[in-house]
């Protein structure tokens, strides 16, 4: 009986790489979930509720476009040379929402928009496109709108705290608001080269009566209308020779 | 004992995908050999002796170049989309040696050079480069050589059987022979479009005294000096959706 | 060389690709904005000696040194990426490509 | 995630990549002009649950329907091509790329 038991143990040993208990659909899905988190370099699944997503998800053309192309699953994707990281996800577009910054707090303590925090992983020379998207509230009568994007700087001797990035003039008709994008590639590249120079920006979109139409801190019913930065990068996968 | 035997058989069945007898180096090499033939779309290994290779292998710059770069094994190779054939070998360069043709036989029965046979798999629009390489025997005194490549055509009413493809004039000094390449891309593309028009070519390389220096049928000690065609193709892998 | 496709009703015992859909909504991964689900597929079945053996690089070289290897396995021989749009938990939405997420073909390896 | 490299002296029992050279001259394949030999490598070793599991697309979905599958196998997870110069037996010399001829990485799949 003992030798039979031993023989069975040996057979089991021979098959240890081949028998997998609990081969169920759920265990297979669990394995894929672990994979995805690992490939995205996430330790755990981001803890974000449906409501938070509804609030944060920009209601803007770039998002629609990304969602509309999502099911084109198979791109011609380069297999990469031996040196390339063919395991981790590669990033093509980063959409960054504004966060709060001490420097942007006004005298009365009310925050000003906007400060964008960047990962040190984004290399300035990999930025292909950078656009600041802002939502302009609807107008009641036809009007010309003056959009101004200012960059915060350390206070100069004469008290200047801003320097212009972009300004544009556009006509608006009554109806729904519109999304407007502004090229900020050069500014972003400078911020990435010198992170300490990124103190934030101020957005103004004044109509002929001086009313600011730019949604900087969304009010009720304005979920998803925050300003955001759309950054397209060429992600040459990290070299990870093993 | 019978139930024990049955249990063992079941255990064996469970492991049938997992135990592989004769897991030796030679069996592994054999499997790789089968793979290579399959990937090259060859049913068996070409039956060619070392001597035959010595005779056939052109002693020309393109061959040296290919052999010199062979160990650059890992190119950035595209993974291909779902539709691409990522199993079979892709062809980049085809070196074709001349074969015999009935049409090229002279009245006295001595074959004329050269007839090149092409696979119907080569598509004319995939040809990037096509060069005819010819070897010119060494000369004893400095001389001008007139190289003429003629294309055979069906005899016309006036008896014309040739039409010119290329002619060039070059100076040769005493010493070793030289390899000369001639662009024949257009001719090759026409042959591929209309295979029936490929009746062969005649190569002439006359010095100032009318001696033909072109090696068309290698004599003793002239192994590897046959004319040959070097064709570079863009091999977009065959679509093989399953 | 090119892999069999099966479904849950197949009687095929040999190495085959079977459908499997990963539904992110079903397990509450709302942080993945798109796709909401995708077809991952999986490999299953028996491997005879050279059946469907695309990459014969698994079995042992030295019989005397088994190292627990399992011989030819039914495993993916071709995979493709998916594009994904997701929150990364840092106030950022990322659109990128994740390699080797879909099994296109199975074989014995 | 990224595969272990071993040699014939390794005591590693887990899934690992081992060296293997294919020598065309040694078995008389003179029709292959270049390379005369190349490093193919191979995979061998044991697979625990998620150890080195790069592509978790092999194990069964329905426990009730085993179909002879062998669970996680030590198998190539990254392969690369080689360029080859060879006679094709039709008076032609071909230079081309053969996909998936070198094992760059092994994993449990």
């Amino acid at each position: 009986e003992n030798s039979e038991q031993k023989e069975n143990v040996e057979k089991e040993g021979l098959c240890n790489a081949c028998t997998w208990r609990q081969n169920t659909k759920s265990s297979r899905i669990e394995a894929i979930k672990i994979q995805i988190l690992s490939k995205l370099r996430l330790e755990t699944a981001p803890n974000i509720s449906k409501d938070a997503i509804r609030q944060l998800l920009p209601k803007a053309p770039p998002l629609r476009e990304l969602i509309d192309q999502y099911d084109v699953q198979r791109d011609d994707s380069s297999d990469g040379s031996l040196e390339d990281d063919d395991y981790h996800a590669t990033t093509e577009t980063i959409i960054t929402m504004p966060t709060e910054s001490d420097f942007l707090m006004q005298v009365d303590g009310k925050p000003k928009c906007c400060f964008f925090k960047f990962s040190s992983k984004i290399q300035y020379n990999k930025v292909v496109k950078a656009q600041l998207w802002i939502y302009l509230r609807p107008v009641e009568t036809p009007t010309t709108v003056f959009v101004q994007i200012l960059r915060l700087i350390k206070p100069m001797k004469d008290g200047t705290r801003y320097t212009g990035i972009r300004s544009l003039k556009l006509d608006m008709n009554p109806g729904t608001g519109i999304w407007q994008s502004i090229d900020v590639k050069t500014v972003l590249q400078n911020w990435l080269k010198q992170p300490e120079s990124n103190l934030g920006i101020e957005i103004k979109a004044l109509d002929e009566n001086g009313h600011d139409l730019a949604v900087t801190f969304p009010g009720p019913g304005e979920d998803g209308l925050n300003p955001f930065l759309e950054v397209k990068v060429t992600d040459t996968p990290k070299r990870s020779r093993r | 004992e019978n139930s024990e035997q049955k249990e063992n058989v079941e255990k064996e069945g469970l492991c049938n995908a997992c135990t592989w007898r004769q897991n030796t180096k030679s069996s592994r090499i054999e499997a790789i050999k089968i793979q290579i033939l399959s990937k090259l779309r060859l049913e068996t290994a070409p039956n060619i002796s070392k001597d035959a290779i010595r005779q056939l292998l052109p002693k020309a710059p393109p061959l040296r170049e290919l052999i010199d770069q062979y160990d650059v094994q890992r190119d950035d190779s595209s993974d291909g989309s779902l539709e691409d054939d990522d199993y079979h070998a892709t062809t980049e360069t085809i070196i074709t040696m001349p074969t015999e043709s009935d049409f090229l036989m002279q009245v006295d029965g001595k074959p004329k050079c050269c007839f090149f046979k092409f696979s119907s798999k080569i598509q004319y629009n995939k040809v990037v480069k096509a060069q005819l390489w010819i070897y010119l025997r060494p000369v004893e005194t400095p001389t001008t050589v007139f190289v003429q490549i003629l294309r055979l055509i069906k005899p016309m009413k006036d008896g014309t059987r040739y039409t010119g493809i290329r002619s060039l004039k070059l100076d040769m000094n005493p010493g070793t022979g030289i390899w000369q390449s001639i662009d024949v891309k257009t001719v090759l593309q026409n042959w591929l479009k209309q295979p029936e028009s490929n009746l062969g070519i005649e190569i002439k390389a006359l010095d100032e005294n009318g001696h033909d220096l072109a090696v068309t049928f290698p004599g003793p000690g002239e192994d590897g000096l046959n004319p040959f065609l070097e064709v570079k193709v863009t091999d977009t892998p065959k679509r093989s959706r399953r | 060389d090119f892999g069999l496709d099966c479904d849950e009703h197949s009687t095929e015992s040999r190495c085959c690709r079977y459908p499997l859909t990963v539904d992110f909504e079903a397990f509450g991964w709302d942080w993945i904005i798109a796709p909401k689900r995708y077809k991952a597929n999986y490999c299953s079945g028996e491997c005879e000696f050279v059946f469907l053996q695309k990459y014969p690089h698994t079995h042992l070289v030295h019989q005397a040194n088994p190292r627990g290897s399992a011989g030819p396995c039914c495993t993916p021989t071709k995979m493709s990426p998916i594009n994904m749009l997701y929150f990364n938990g840092k106030e950022q939405i990322i659109y990128g490509k994740i390699p080797a997420m879909v099994v296109d073909r199975c074989g014995c390896s | 995630d990224f595969g272990l490299d071993c040699d014939e002296h390794s005591t590693e029992s887990r899934c690992c990549r081992y060296p293997l050279t294919v020598d065309f001259e040694a078995f008389g394949w003179d029709w292959i002009i270049a390379p005369k030999r190349y490093k193919a490598n191979y995979c061998s070793g044991e697979c625990e649950f998620v150890f080195l599991q790069k592509y978790p697309h092999t194990h069964l979905v329905h426990q009730a329907n085993p179909r002879g599958s062998a669970g996680p196998c030590c198998t190539p997870t990254k392969m690369s091509p080689i360029n080859m110069l060879y006679f094709n037996g039709k008076e032609q010399i071909i230079y081309g790329k053969i996909p998936a001829m070198v094992v760059d990485r092994c994993g449990c799949s």
């Epitope: 053309p61 770039p62 084109v72 008709n173 109806g175 608001g177 519109i178 | - | - | -």
Partner: antibody, heavy 119, light 110 residues
Amino acid sequence: QVTLKESGPVLVKPTETLTLTCTVSGIDLSHTDISWVRQAPGKGLEWVGIISYAGKKYYASWAKGRLTISKDTSKNQVVLTMTNMDPVDTATYYCARGVPAYSHGGDLWGQGTLVTVSS
Amino acid sequence: DIVMTQSPATLSLSPGERATLSCTSSQSVYHANWLSWFQQKPGQPPKLLIYWASTLAYGVPSRFSGSGSGTDFTLTISSLQPEDAATYYCAGGYGGGRYAFGQGTKVEIK
């Protein structure tokens, strides 16, 4: 003044190619998606396709292979080209700002142009 | 293909009455809320009423409201006015560049 206006032939013969132009004013096509929608006489609305702010195109499944949408941002124009026209393609063709069903897309429409396909 | 079904095909009500129009999609719209409602009167282009399933478009009277999520949606006109006589269409977005309109509900005022 923000407007969209469709223009093109009123009558097209079967098998011919239809080319319609949507000319916009007060709209920057580099920031705005433009959609095409059609409506057969007495029938409902039918989505035809989109050209996105960034130039990507999305077509209804029935229109793939026959439809091309392009734009010339400098001329403020979006062009719809549909090959192999058939009498069933007789409809009023509209262009609209944005994408109906996404956000406030479809908040602004052209007046539409009636295209009749007949020999 | 995606099918969006609107019911009823025709709705005949008196001024001041409450109108309830239904729209059912054969598959869930993207993000559960990629759905808009349009009003169209004869000889005119459509007019946007509701987007994100429940958000009232600019300049649309508050008697119009939208509700629902996923596959089932409702447009409600709390108190019908004579000018509300029109055909109403729902439009759904599904991601992957797929969009569809319902076949429409005609609202008549008695």
